[in-house]
Interface confidence: medium
């Protein structure tokens, strides 16, 4: 089952080389796997990583570095992702999503 999760920050503009933080507000009782996607114009959405709330661990997609995206926060209420060392190619719409089973 798919759940829609509310992102608190709707739009951010940052300089290259800086960082940005995105917050994902979780539905009450959200458990399981919380996924982060990047959707860029003209491309299919790309999953960057997912958070396994059962083991409190993060699984990265291939080619994604632990230093680039940092996910943390309370999985019961919200989950935050920091994007570091921003480049122009990081521009796009970031989504979080969860599947309950």
């Amino acid at each position: 089952k798919s759940s829609n999760l509310e992102g608190r920050t709707k739009s951010v503009i940052r300089q290259t080389g800086s960082s940005a933080e995105i917050t994902c507000d979780l539905a009450e009782g959200s458990t399981g796997y919380i996924h982060w996607y990047l959707h860029q114009e003209g491309k299919a959405p790309q999953r960057l990583l997912y958070y396994d709330s059962y083991t409190s661990s993060v699984v990265l997609e291939s080619g994604i570095s632990p230093g680039k995206y940092d996910t943390y926060g309370s999985t019961r209420k919200n989950l935050r992702m920091i994007l570091r060392n921003l480049i122009e190619n990081d521009s796009g719409v970031y989504y979080c999503a969860t599947w309950d089973g």
């Epitope: 661990s57 993060v58 997609e61 632990p66 230093g67 940092d70 943390y72 926060g73």
Partner: antibody, heavy 120, light 107 residues
Framework: EVQLVESGGGLVQPGGPLRLSCAAS????????MNWVRQAPGKGLEWVSA????????YYADSVKGRFTISRDNSKNTLYLQMNSLRAEDTAVYYC?????????????WGQGTMVTVSS | DIQMTQSPSSLSASVGDRVTITCRAS??????LNWYQQKPGKAPKLLIY???SLQSGVPSRFSGSGSGTDFTLTISSPQPEDFATYYC?????????FGQGTKVEIK
Amino acid sequence: EVQLVESGGGLVQPGGPLRLSCAASGFTFSSYAMNWVRQAPGKGLEWVSAISGSGGSTYYADSVKGRFTISRDNSKNTLYLQMNSLRAEDTAVYYCAKADYGVVYYFDYWGQGTMVTVSS
Amino acid sequence: DIQMTQSPSSLSASVGDRVTITCRASQSISTYLNWYQQKPGKAPKLLIYAASSLQSGVPSRFSGSGSGTDFTLTISSPQPEDFATYYCQQSYSTPYTFGQGTKVEIK
């Protein structure tokens, strides 16, 4: 000058625990992911675990998942590896390594290593 | 997991010879490939990252090339301090895996 100094190694019986530490200096510790890499005697290098700058994201090799826990204290500029249920095959020199990333992720600074021996 | 295979496992060379070490990945890793040098009893040292970028402070006689699955580390004219073991490592996906190493010995 970047420095990484590991400690906590030693002789431990199979099934026992051990905690390794890595004291970091010379860079903004909380801004960088950190890793543990090990090397069994006479063997090659094996990546063990990584942790993001905030400590919120952790990653493990399958061989240690569920037994080892990586953590960090950014206020003390220290990286840790809690090792439980140790096995003979965990015997190795354990290195902490600072990670950097640009186009790719790489280990640009390493500590001198600390030896862990698991034996009865 | 991505397997990294280095060849040869060892080689003998003279000072000034050209040394080439190859590394093959079990699947395409783009340029997510790093090279390290290790001397006996010492920690590894980063030489090359992103397949061909020379780490700061590393002599220009070291160079790297390749993309996809096949990569090469070249020492154009080895000096006595270059005789060591060299490892490739992929950082395309976790677990980050290393090649088994290539020991470069003095002939």
